[in-house]
């Protein structure tokens, strides 16, 4: 996930927010799956 050629603060911020959103979605899916499997 190189996410482009820009290294300014806004580009870094947007990339960080994307990672957080992605991880939240992945962890949320895993949690729902665990609850479902119980």
């Amino acid at each position: 996930h190189s996410d482009g050629i820009f290294t300014d603060s806004y580009s870094r911020y947007r990339k960080q927010m994307a990672v957080k959103k992605y991880l939240a979605a992945v962890l949320g899916k895993r949690y729902k799956q665990r609850v479902k499997n119980k």
């Epitope: 996410d3 482009g4 300014d8 994307a18």
Partner: antibody, heavy 111, light 111 residues
Framework: QSVEESGGRLVTPGTPLTLTCTAS????????MGWVRQAPGKGLEWIGD?????TTDYASWVNGRFTISRTSTTVTLKMTSLTTEDTATYFC????????WGPGTLVTVSS | AAVLTQTPSPVSAAVGGTVTIKCQSS????????LAWYQQKPGQPPKLLIY???TLASGVPSRFKGSGSGTQFTLTINGVQCDDAATYYC???????????FGGGTEVVVK
């Protein structure tokens, strides 16, 4: 290096439509991609973008009517509940800073 | 959503002269510098000129200069050339991308 939009056409109000963005000489999967539109004779309007992780952000006016998604080679803009106000040229562009634009694809919504 | 107000069109300049276009945001952009400038000629997609308020995009002539911070930004074109006749847009990036928006555009006429 270039990007290109496709899928624009004349549709009637309420008809859903999907636009596609493809690239030549660029690995699209390595870049965030944005969508922008421009009504005839009007200014630019930011629609939203998608990160390399597939997470999306949209302008507040979109109100869930548009959805951006991606595969390893394409980025798509799915549009629903279209009205005449959505008549515009739709552009896709590379990076959060929209550093490389396609020529655009014209969407006309008319009854 | 944010509102970006640009210098009213058209702005007229003589070849070799200087053009100044202002862009005012209704709220501070991210990190006080998340603002870009684009040039668009009729029938063409926009082209990124400046990002992060003052950083010149690749291949853009040094006669283009961006400045400003927070809510007030300026694009200056020194030694204006005939080729600079176009419409110029600013784009603000915000803490919440849902607020991202373009300014209304400023047409530059070169005499």
């Amino acid at each position: 290096q270039s990007v290109e939009e496709s899928g624009g056409r004349l549709v009637t109000p309420g008809t859903p439509l999907t636009l596609t963005c493809t690239a030549s000489g660029i690995d699209l999967s390595g870049y965030a991609m944005g969508w922008v539109r421009q009504a005839p004779g009007k200014g630019l309007e930011w629609i939203g973008d998608i990160s390399t992780y597939g997470t999306t952000d949209y302008a507040s006016w979109v109100n869930g009517r548009f959805t951006i998604s991606r595969t390893s080679t394409t980025v798509t803009l799915k549009m629903t509940s279209l009205t005449t106000e959505d008549t515009a040229t739709y552009f896709c562009a590379r990076d959060y800073w929209l550093s490389l634009w396609g020529p655009g694809t014209l969407v006309t919504v008319s009854s | 959503a944010a509102v970006l107000t640009q210098t009213p069109s058209p702005v007229s300049a003589a070849v070799g002269g200087t053009v100044t276009i202002k862009c005012q945001s209704s709220q501070s952009v991210y990190d006080n510098n998340a603002l870009a400038w684009y040039q668009q000629k009729p029938g063409q997609p926009p082209k990124l000129l400046i990002y992060a308020a003052s950083t010149l995009a690749s291949g853009v002539p040094s006669r283009f200069k961006g400045s400003g911070s927070g809510t007030q930004f300026t694009l200056t074109i020194n030694g204006v050339q005939c080729d600079d006749a176009a419409t110029y847009y600013c784009l603000g990036g915000y803490d919440d991308p849902a607020d991202n928006a373009f300014g209304g555009g400023t047409e530059v006429v070169v005499k």
